[in-house]
């Protein structure tokens, strides 16, 4: 039977909105993989942990990509 | 070869449970869900639900959840399906299935209801 | 939860004929959908997925095609050991099968 689309992704509807980095408590980057033909970003909100999926191809995604690795080799030692 | 085994038939009393069993070999049991199928005699296949052998996560077909329970045991590479309340209308046969490519059924195991 | 309806119900064809089948969902299902042939005694059988693609084995006789949520499928070329029940299955949201279709030779 072919895997259901519900459980291929975890994304069902994909936001191109700028997303704060402060407002940020997570970002997950889940890789593509024979369940899920598509690379998946999953930010969680600090706010009430609200989970959005984010559009990988979007420029404002990228950039805030960059800035939250450029965060986090800032605290690394 | 893939291959899902199950037993041919179940002759259970109405009101009494039944465990229906499905047992995969020729793959890799945890890397593929499986999915189990009704169909009544002369009636189309109904999707009852889904279980992901490698942590045991479950959706259902909401006519079934109060109706089916799915489990697994990865060491003997086994999925079950347990009914409940048994009654006439739960007389069919039972089919697992699973997600892989070349995908593989079970020959199915009739269930018949009677007291 | 989608549904999915499926016609006819049951069909006659000649040998050598060719016969279509549509299935109807109550969404868009992305091209989520596939085809089975059920023989009794027997697990169903994969012919189509994802609309149109063939399942390996199976012959170019068996197409598929549609979108949003309009799906039909085709075989030319009817043989003998086409007769069957026929299954439409969405996958977009879990999983729902359509009524089925009991395909006969004249």
């Known amino acids: 039977v072919p895997l259901s689309r519900t459980v291929r992704c975890t994304c069902i509807s994909i936001s191109n909105q700028p997303v704060n980095p402060r407002s940020l408590e997570k970002l997950e980057i889940i890789p593509a993989s024979q369940f899920c033909p598509r690379v998946e970003i999953i930010a969680t909100m600090k706010k009430k942990g609200e989970k959005r999926c984010l559009n990988p191809e979007s420029k404002a995604i990228k950039n805030l990509l960059k800035a939250v690795s450029k965060e986090r080799s800032k605290r690394s030692p | 070869q893939v291959q899902l085994q199950q037993p041919g038939a179940e002759l259970v009393r109405p009101g009494a449970s039944v465990k229906l069993s499905c047992k995969a070999s020729?793959?890799?049991?945890?890397?593929?869900?499986m999915i189990w199928v009704k169909q009544r005699p002369g009636q189309g296949l109904e999707w009852i639900g889904m279980i992901d052998p490698s942590d045991s996560a479950t959706h259902y077909n909401q006519m079934f959840k109060d109706k089916a329970t799915l489990t697994v045991d990865k060491s003997s590479s086994t999925a079950y399906m347990q009914l409940s309340s048994l009654t006439s209308e739960d007389s069919a046969v039972y089919y697992c299935?699973?997600?892989?490519?070349?995908?593989?059924w079970g020959q199915g195991t009739l269930v018949t209801v009677s007291a | 939860d989608i549904q999915m309806t499926q016609s006819p119900s049951s069909l006659s064809a000649s040998l050598g004929g060719r016969v279509t089948i549509t299935c109807k969902a109550s969404?868009?299902?992305?091209?989520?959908i596939a085809w089975y042939q059920h023989k009794p005694g027997k697990g169903p059988r994969l012919l189509i997925y994802d609309t149109s693609t063939l399942q390996p084995g199976i012959p170019s006789r068996f197409t598929g095609s549609g979108s949003g949520r309009d799906y039909s499928f085709s075989i030319s070329n009817l043989e003998p050991e086409d007769i069957a029940t026929y299954y439409c299955?969405?996958?977009?949201?879990?999983?729902?099968f359509g009524g089925g279709t009991k395909l006969e030779i004249k």
């Open positions: 969404q868009d299902i992305h091209k989520y």
């Open positions: 299955l969405q996958y977009d949201d879990l999983y729902t």
């Open positions: 299935a699973n997600t892989r490519h070349d995908e593989s």
């Open positions: 020729g793959y890799t049991f945890t890397s593929h869900w």
